[in-house]
Amino acid sequence: MNGRVDYLVTEEEINLTRGPSGLGFNIVGGTDQQYVSNDSGIYVSRIKENGAAALDGRLQEGDKILSVNGQDLKNLLHQDAVDLFRNAGYAVSLRVQHRLQVQNGPIGHRGEGDPSGIPIFMVLVPVFALTMVAAWAFMRYRQQL
């Protein structure tokens, strides 16, 4: 992979109630199905329309699921991870890692259509410029007093 990619990584606890058709999402990953190079983690690959996850609205395609009902998803075979979800009961607590790309370049796991992120300098340069202008205005104001 070329170029540097910056991410804003946040974690969230998502509590889902199993609906009539289940939890309503698909997963990829596992030690026997690496979806992201050098990472055997479990990722959300699809949110089903009108399913429990879609109606809740917080779980997103590309999210990494760290645990289910407190049980770590590290180093699991793909089918073992699937079975863990299927046997998780009616109320399911997911520890999820959201990853937001903030610079153009290759992306770790955002599915088939990689969204182009916001280059970090496009955020920092205006902030820095505003700070400088504010400081200059403040100094001028102080001089006038």
């Epitope: 058709s21 289940g22 939890l23 309503g24 999402f25 698909n26 997963i27 990829v28 026997d32 199905q33 979806y35 959300v44 690959s45 699809r46 089903k48 793909h78 089918q79 699937v82 979800f85 299927r86 599915g111 088939e112």
Partner: nanobody, 126 residues
Framework: QVQLVESGGGPVQAGGSLRLSCAAS????????MAWFRQAPGKEREFVAA???????YYADSVKGRFTISRDNAKNTVYLQMNSLSPEDTAVYYC?????????????????????WGQGTQVTVS
């Protein structure tokens, strides 16, 4: 969004064979669940066969023993080998894909399991 392109359809005599192919786009084809459905004129879309990421296969009772689904992950392609064809197999055959495994109980014959669909290829058995 996965692009699916079917090929291999056409006219065939009863008792004959055809092999359908479905080429898929995407860098993670090996994680896709792939399926074939068919739709005859004036009938509902009908499940034919499916294959999971690890090669597990599922068939409709009407094609068991005659049709074989397979996949080649290196070529991003799924195949449907159809033998002992009869006029009842005449239909437009559609390829379908879902990325990843459902965390709910899997119903291979349910079209809602699949997000992406090809345009179809016509099979006519006379």
């Amino acid at each position: 969004q996965v692009q699916l392109v079917e090929s291999g359809g056409g006219p065939v005599q009863a008792g004959g064979s055809l092999r359908l192919s479905c080429a898929a786009s995407g860098r993670t084809f090996s994680t896709y669940v792939m399926a074939w459905f068919r739709q005859a004129p004036g009938k509902e879309r009908e499940f034919v066969a499916a294959i999971s990421w690890n090669g597990s296969t599922y068939y409709a009772d009407s094609v068991k023993g005659r049709f074989t689904i397979s996949r080649d992950n290196a070529k991003n392609t799924v195949y449907l080998q159809m033998n002992s064809l009869s006029p009842e197999d005449t239909a437009v055959y559609y390829c379908a894909a879902a990325i990843g495994s459902t965390v709910d109980s899997y119903s291979p014959s349910d079209p809602l399991e699949y997000d992406d669909w090809g345009q179809g290829t016509q099979v006519t058995v006379s």
